[in-house]
């Protein structure tokens, strides 16, 4: 089972001191989002027991193996279901804690009930504050049963559930009809998937016989040991104040595990720590009792004394749970409760025994789960013990399970069961992922999903050029880091594969599927320089550049021109996709802007060195258009134009430009300057009689502005043909009708 413990601190006088802590003893637990260990999650589960909304609870991570929930402001915040989720992949496990209000109308005699499939479960709700009304039982939040208040027996309402099946598991509650749901008694029913003492898919396998209140897991046959006990069969007590599968965790605070509720993976549920009992786990065990919830009785023999944390403490010369075994009887010594080997390895297993008469090599044997008996190949005899060594044939998956070391002498016999886990070396299910590439290196993420078992101890990356028969190059990397493959050939495909290993002999897995990764093409090395540029309008710029002459073909696909507008902090990039190009027209620029300009050669996705920068100032855009332009014929050759100055001028006008064009004519228009900018009228002379003309005008400051509206007017008739229009008395260079 996953080594995951949810601790609830039950000092309930002050909810603000209440906390829940989830502790994981798993390798790589809670390390966050990396592929080697999903995070520990600790949360209140409001799906069944809903409490009034309050301020959000605070979650604090203490390293990678522990997470704590605080911030409870009122007692009702505590009532309900809390869960902690830990472990990776198929081992992901949820541990559940159910909290009852100490002031509720009804209180559970026992919160967690673990029963076997087919058993009768009896939930008992004790009356704490009586109400003369119906009692409603619910299962997972839905109505289940009603009792009349007269149906209480000895101040308790009982719910009998005969022949329970796994789907009956869940949260049960008993509530007076008129009471707040927070005054309910909440229970957790865990129904094992098998009958008593059995486990496995068809419940065909026999449980190891869990001691000290341990519960046999119906899926894997392992004992889920109560807090404070360890070993394959929970046969060993931890030191006072310690818990976890290997007794590696310590209860916080000076009073040890007092006031703490421990919740473990199903099918165990929750209990007080070893040596404590009561609804708030604050009462020490009565004499003669020990263990979690003080559920165990010592019954020590031969002068043994009862310790409320560990059970019988035997005097010299005696051992056994009740001190019932003489030290003359042979005894298996220091056998590890769990061993782990990799598939297809041939490990050596040692088993040591002592006793009187002294065990010899032939008196110690090893039994596999399938019943096969192995005899030791050699024995080391020391003054206080004999250690037999067994050479195990090549391991297969079916060898996973409980092995047994047995010693037999004329003084009696002893056996010790231990769990052997045969692990499958990890094999990548996917190819590694390319993160970035350059011409001579590839950056690769080796983190991939895998079949088989973790944890991953090393990652090997094998690579060689595609279609090559040369040896593979290999690099060993840290599982959690990206890898850079160096000194590669440019523009070359490489076949890259991952190999994962787990700890222990024979932990190397098969190579994963290959993937093709191609290095980038060479970087362009030539540095262009800017030959020149000229402004073709307030928003247009023509640029030209050159490249140094070098022998051989040009390494490049095109050019990138960059214009940097420092005032606005904006960059404009223009791609010229021909490596032969040496000029470009940049349009849509911002008039009146100071630009820094450079050009660089590119090849594939790589940029070469930039040219030395040039600084370009575009002329500002011109002023707004003159307003209310009006034309009035004065004679057969003269038309007077009147207008109003533009509004919101950015500076003084230097001149106006008038455009004159014969209406419907095909010729180019004529531009006439009005050099006295203070004027608001002018006379255009030298026009043809009886001719329709179009006029528009614009102002100039540093650059030409916007055109005004176009006006139309005809000269008067019967005049002679003029030589061409003039403004005031200055002649134009050519006639309008030419």
């Amino acid at each position: 089972a996953v080594d995951l413990t949810l601790l609830a601190n039950l000092r309930l006088t002050d909810p603000q001191r209440f906390f829940l802590t989830c502790v994981s003893g798993e390798a790589g637990a809670g390390r966050g989002s990396d592929a080697w260990g999903p995070p520990l999650l600790l949360e209140k589960d409001d799906r069944i027991v809903r409490t009034p909304p309050g301020p959000p609870l605070r979650l604090a991570r203490n390293g990678s193996h522990q997470v704590t929930l605080r911030g409870f402001s009122k007692p009702s915040d505590l009532v309900g279901v809390f869960s902690c989720v830990g472990g990776a992949g198929a081992r992901r496990t949820r541990v559940i804690y159910v909290h009852n209000s100490p002031g509720a109308h009804l209180l559970p005699d026992k919160v967690t009930h673990t029963v076997n499939k087919g058993d009768t479960a009896v939930l008992s709700a004790r009356v704490h504050k009586e109400k003369q009304t119906d009692v409603i039982w619910k299962s997972n939040g839905s109505y289940f049963y009603t009792l009349d208040w007269h149906e209480a027996q000895d101040g308790r309402f009982l719910l009998q559930l005969p022949n329970v099946q796994p789907p009956s598991s869940g949260i049960y509650s008993a509530t007076y009809l008129e009471a707040s749901p927070l005054g309910s008694a909440f229970f957790r029913l865990i129904v094992r998937g098998c009958g008593a003492g059995r486990w496995g898919p068809g419940c065909t396998k026999e449980c190891p016989g869990c001691l000290h209140g341990g519960v046999c897991h119906d899926h894997d046959g392992e004992c889920v040991c109560p807090p404070g006990f360890t070993g394959t069969r929970c046969e060993q007590a931890c030191r006072e104040g310690r818990f976890g599968q290997s007794c590696q965790e310590q209860c916080p605070g000076i009073s040890g595990c007092r006031g703490l509720t421990f919740c473990l993976p199903d099918p165990y549920g929750c209990s007080c720590g070893s040596g404590w009992r009561g609804s708030q786990c604050q009462e020490a065990c009565a004499p003669g009792h020990f263990g979690a919830d003080c559920r165990l009785q010592c019954q020590c023999q031969n002068g043994g004394t009862c310790d409320r944390f560990s059970g019988c403490v035997c005097p010299s010369g005696w051992h056994g749970v009740h001190c019932e075994k003489s030290d003359r009887i042979p005894q298996i010594l220091n056998m590890a409760s769990e061993l782990e080997f990799n598939l297809e390895t041939m490990p050596r297993i040692n088993c040591a025994a002592a006793g009187n008469p002294f065990p010899v090599r032939g008196s110690i044997e090893l039994r596999k789960p399938d019943g096969t008996v192995l005899l030791s190949t050699k024995a080391i005899v020391e003054p206080e013990k004999t250690t037999a060594e067994f050479e195990v044939p090549r391991l297969v998956l079916a060898d996973s399970g409980f092995w047994e070391c047995r010693v037999s002498t004329s003084g009696g016999q002893d056996s010790r069961r231990f769990k052997v886990n045969v692990k499958v070396p990890p094999v990548p299910l996917a190819a590694p992922r390319l993160l970035t590439k350059q011409s001579r290196q590839l950056v690769v993420s080796p983190l991939v999903s895998f079949s088989g078992d973790g944890p991953i101890s090393t990652v090997r990356l094998h690579y060689r050029p595609q279609d090559s028969t040369m040896d593979w190059s290999t690099i060993v990397v840290d599982p959690s880091e990206n890898v850079t493959l160096m000194n590669l050939r440019p523009k070359t495909g490489y076949s890259v594969r991952v190999q994962l290993s787990r700890p222990g002999e024979g932990g190397e897995g098969a190579w994963g599927p290959p993937t093709l990764m191609t290095t980038d093409c060479p970087e362009p090395l030539l540095q262009p320089w800017l030959e020149g540029w000229h402004v073709e309008g307030t928003d247009r710029l023509r640029v030209s550049w050159s490249l140094p002459l070098v022998p051989g073909p040009l390494v490049g696909d095109g050019f990138l021109l960059r214009l940097w507008d420092g005032t606005r902090g904006q960059e404009r990039r223009e791609n010229v996709s021909s490596p032969q190009a040496r000029t470009a027209l940049l349009t849509g620029l911002t008039p009146g802007t100071h630009y820094q300009l450079d050009v660089q050669l590119y090849h594939c996705t790589l940029l070469g060195p930039a040219s030395p920068p040039a600084h370009v100032l575009l002329p500002p855009s011109g002023p707004p258009a003159p307003r209310h332009l009006h034309a009035q014929a004065l004679s057969d050759s003269e038309i007077q134009l009147t207008w109003k100055h533009p509004e919101a001028l950015p500076g003084p006008i230097s001149k106006y430009v008038v455009e004159v064009q014969v209406a419907g004519g095909a010729g180019d228009p004529l531009w006439i300057d009005v050099d006295r900018p203070e004027e608001t009228s002018t006379i255009i002379r030298g026009l043809n009689a009886s001719t329709r003309y179009l006029f528009r005008m614009r102002a100039s400051i540093q650059g030409l502005g916007d055109w005004s509206n176009t006006v139309e007017e005809s000269t008067l008739g019967n005049g002679l043909q003029a030589e061409g229009p003039v403004q005031e008395s200055r002649a134009a260079e050519e006639g309008l009708d030419q």
């Epitope: 003369q132 119906d134 009603t146 009792l147 009349d148 208040w149 149906e151 009809l177 008129e178």
Partner: antibody, heavy 117, light 108 residues
Amino acid sequence: EVQLLESGGGLVQPGGSLRLSCAASGFTFSSYKMGWVRQAPGRGLEWVSSIYPSGGWTHYADSVKGRFTISRDNSKNTLYLQMNSLRAEDTAVYYCARVLLHYFDYWGQGTLVTVSS
Amino acid sequence: QSVLTQPASVSGSPGQSITISCTGTSSDVGGYKYVSWYQQHPGKAPKLIISDVNNRPSGVSDRFSGSKSGNTASLTISGLQAEDDGDYYCSSYASSSYTSSTTWVFGG
């Protein structure tokens, strides 16, 4: 689908007896409180009696106390109402109903009991 | 047998809203949040339309709503439709806290 089907109604003389049955289906009958409600012709509804899931506790309206007995057989998913010493004022359509918490969430179609000489 | 008081009849035009009142005492309507309403069409069994004063069971139109103030509960039907025609009964749970046994009382 929850279904309640009453039977056993009919014409009976004053002072006579009648036993009504209600066959339940579509839910876990043994988990629910059940009840009888009646409706005299042209009148409103009147609660008659209720029984708890275990069958151990029963309640009656004052108007029928001592004359009517409610019972149930959880193995047959059936509710009963034994009516003795019937009076003319007991004439009504008798409905069997399921109790959820404190209200009648499903009703049968009713069976008519007529007490007349 | 105590009976809750309801108006003999309430009428309205299609699309209108109507409210039916139900008056009891502090021992029933006033004492609990356990008021329910039932709809009955002629010749049919009653059907639950409101529980717990204002809870609508699934499948019941949201045009039906309930409320309670003091000893009086109310059922409001908005956007009246022809199929709303029928008898409506209020009911209150009166538990053993107030009487010798669990009882229900109905409006008449």
